[in-house]
């Protein structure tokens, strides 16, 4: 059957999916393209807001946040008190921390 | 396979200038990087000099490092560092070393030894 | 930032528990950006922990780090005779900073 996977290589770690009368391959993290041949930049879209900065890291996009700033993607500003303006801190994450 | 390797290394003399070269292979700073420069003194701790971040060119410098070194981008695959005023203290292995996250560095290249002597 | 390390040398017996301290002057980023990389003569270092306790891709897991803040520990349990190097933590700070610790020699009977 031409809509299976027999034969079909999706590089670095890419999985081949079957469906809707074609194949693709479903990427590993990092990796993107038709075959999972090219480099996907997670920091492309410059995820980091307020001049903090993205490493393009193996378990995904990682902000360093510029002084002042915290949060997930830098979104937060931090009080002269050192209190930070997030509300609360999100399930698993202590506030000042960088989000994964 | 992701390296780098350095390169311009030698013998200079007292308040001379040297310029390394840092060259990537197997990645290019498409991607957002700090590509950092590390020496390390015969039998001490390596010393951090300076870093350009592939996302903006932005660069940060250890304290003791601003004035005298220049680290910039020359290519995609390419990090150069300028040093001016090279004093018998700066001898030391200079390794070209990669933050791709976490402020750690994952990837090194093999160094290249400077040596300031008269 | 200053970064000070257990001094050297630590020795330890094959087998054995080795364990090493990293004081840092102020809190890394995140409390958790502090790295430990083993050296050994003409090679580069080589990162063994990231994010104070993650341990690197291909490295053994008798190899331990923990901590937060400004006091970090790097353990390694069951030493090996190919553990004997020089081990030095490193933190990432706020204001894109980086600094390394003066280094701790293990050796290995």
């Known amino acids: 059957d031409l809509d299976d996977c027999a034969g079909r290589a999706c590089a670095n770690g890419g999985t081949c999916v079957e469906g809707g009368g074609a194949h693709r391959c479903s990427c590993a993290l990092g990796f993107g393209g038709r075959d999972c041949r090219e480099r996907a930049d997670p920091c492309a879209a410059r995820p980091c807001a307020h001049g903090g900065r993205c490493y393009a890291h193996f378990s995904g996009l990682v902000c360093a946040c510029a002084p002042g700033y915290m949060g997930a993607r830098c979104e937060f500003p931090v009080h002269p008190d050192g209190a930070s303006a997030l509300p609360a801190a999100p399930p698993g994450l202590r506030p000042g921390d960088p989000q994964r | 396979q992701e390296q780098l390797v350095e390169s311009g290394g030698g013998l200079v003399q007292p308040e001379g200038s040297l310029t390394l070269t840092c060259t990537a292979s197997?990645?290019?700073?498409?991607?957002?990087?700090?590509m950092c420069w590390v020496r390390q003194a015969p039998g001490k701790g390596p010393e951090w000099i300076a870093c350009?971040?592939?996302?903006?060119?932005?660069t940060d410098y250890a304290s003791w490092a601003k004035g005298r070194f220049t680290v910039s981008k020359a290519s995609s695959t390419t990090v150069t560092l300028q040093m001016t005023s090279l004093a018998v203290a700066d001898t030391a292995t200079y390794f070209c070393?990669?933050?791709?996250?976490?402020?750690?560095?994952?990837?090194w290249g093999p160094g290249t030894l400077v040596t300031v002597s008269s | 930032q200053v970064l000070t390390q257990t001094p050297s040398p630590v020795s330890a017996a094959v087998g054995g528990t080795v364990t090493i301290s990293c004081q840092s002057t102020?809190?890394?980023?995140?409390?958790?950006?502090l790295s430990w990389y083993q050296q050994k003569p003409g090679q580069p270092p080589k990162v063994l922990i990231y994010?104070?306790?993650n341990l690197e891709i291909g490295v053994p897991s008798r190899f331990k780090g923990s901590g937060s803040g400004t006091q970090f520990t790097l353990t390694i349990s069951g030493a090996q005779c190919d553990d004997a190097a020089t081990y030095y933590c490193?933190?990432?700070?706020?204001?894109?900073?980086?600094?390394f610790g003066g280094g701790t020699e293990v050796v290995v009977k």
């Open positions: 070393a990669r933050n791709s996250g976490y402020g750690y560095f994952g990837l």
């Open positions: 197997g990645f290019s700073f498409s991607s957002s990087y700090d």
């Open positions: 350009i971040y592939t996302g903006d060119g932005s």
């Open positions: 102020e809190s890394v980023y995140g409390s958790d950006w």
């Open positions: 994010q104070a306790s």
């Open positions: 490193q933190g990432y700070y706020s204001g894109y900073i980086y600094a």
